[in-house]
């Protein structure tokens, strides 16, 4: 592995839609794949109403927005679908959202980020 | 990388089995990923089939499930396709391609698929 | 079976266009929705996965977006060589299903 490389071995699985999908609902899942891919986990979830529901948790391949993310972290304002990627062995158990804030001029009430959720 | 390549009898007659193999080149299919068979008929409607697993275990299409077998041959990197009791409506090109994960289901890897006649 | 619907089976667009195609799901699939390229010859490659993500050597004039149940695939600057069928494809709940393809033809 490449020295500071956080490498994938397994992440949190879990799918909201087990029982049609035919798998378990939740456990460990084994990130197994090509030498030359990164391996990454990830979690997605909603906002249904200030309640967290997560929609699936695993492992994900190869994806350059996960790179080196240590860190389960959504930045998008406010997406309907929240998804977060990271390195490194069951990084996806928690996950949060910080809305990265625009750039504008600074006023005199300065904004205060919201809140992250945490699983 | 990791290439797939379908092979199999270009014609079947009705009411018998089709079986078509898949040649995977650059990774062990023993390693990781799911190992599917999709479909492709004449109209361009795909319709995936099934799956066999890394580990062996297989998942089907509902709607074929009493006419499918996906299986593998570990030695030889190979994964396979049968086809019971075919009829002309099963004449498609036949694809064969990965996904990596569970929850990860993007197609990242094809073959170049063949085309199999049912007909008399 | 979750359905996937792309409501135009063939478009015809000018080199240098942006073209927008279409596909919608019977029901939400939270945005586990990929898109794929068929050639005329009949080769197949993934463009685009989870909605917008780009995958690894796909050319940045396409992109993704979408939501719920809606989703689209967008070719900027439409050049020769993006005249295909693209397929979007659901991946939230098994069996995995396909739109029925969106023909993209030179005007």
């Known amino acids: 592995a490449i020295l500071g490389r956080s490498e994938t071995q397994e992440c949190l699985f879990f799918n909201a839609n087990w029982e049609k999908d035919r798998t378990n609902q939740t456990g460990v899942e084994p990130c197994y794949g090509d030498k030359d891919k990164r391996r990454h986990c990830f979690a997605t979830w909603k906002n249904i109403s200030g309640s967290i529901e997560i929609v699936k948790q695993g492992c994900w391949l190869d994806d350059i927005n996960c790179y080196d993310r240590t860190d389960c972290v959504e930045k998008k304002d406010s997406p309907e679908v929240y998804f977060c990627c990271c390195e490194g062995n069951m990084c996806n158990e928690k996950f949060s959202y910080f809305p990265e804030m625009e750039v504008t001029q600074p006023t005199s009430n300065p904004v205060t980020p919201k809140p992250p959720y945490y699983n | 990388d990791v290439q797939l390549q379908e092979s199999g009898p270009g014609l079947v007659k009705p009411s018998q089995s089709l079986s078509l193999t898949c040649s995977v080149t650059?990774?062990?299919?023993?390693?990781?990923?799911?190992w599917n068979w999709i479909r492709q008929f004449p109209g361009n409607k795909l319709e995936w089939m099934g799956y066999?697993?890394?580990?062996?275990?297989?998942n089907y299409n509902p709607s074929l499930i009493n006419r499918i077998s996906i299986t593998r041959d570990t030695s030889k990197n190979q994964f396979f396709l049968k086809l019971n009791s075919v009829t002309t409506e099963d004449t498609a090109t036949y694809f064969c391609?990965?996904?990596?994960?569970?929850?990860?289901?993007?197609?990242?890897?094809w073959g170049q698929g063949t085309l199999v006649t049912v007909s008399a | 079976d979750i359905q996937m619907t792309q409501t135009t089976s063939s478009l015809s667009a000018s080199l240098g266009d942006r073209v927008t195609i279409s596909c919608r799901a019977s029901?939400?699939?939270?945005?586990?929705l990929n898109w794929y390229q068929q050639k005329p010859d009949g080769t197949v490659k993934l463009l685009i996965y989870?909605?917008?993500r780009l995958h690894s050597g796909v050319p940045s004039r396409f992109s993704g977006s979408g939501s719920g149940t809606d989703y689209s695939l967008t070719i900027t600057n439409l050049e020769q060589e993006d005249i295909a069928t693209y397929f979007c494809?659901?991946?939230?709940?098994?069996?995995?299903?396909f739109g029925g393809g969106t023909k993209l033809e030179i005007k």
């Open positions: 391609a990965s996904y990596a994960y569970r929850n990860d289901v993007r197609f990242a890897y």
């Open positions: 494809q659901q991946g939230n709940t098994l069996p995995w299903t």
């Open positions: 650059g990774y062990s299919i023993t390693s990781g990923y799911y």
């Open positions: 029901q939400d699939i939270s945005n586990f």
């Open positions: 989870f909605t917008s």
């Open positions: 066999i697993s890394y580990d062996g275990s297989n």
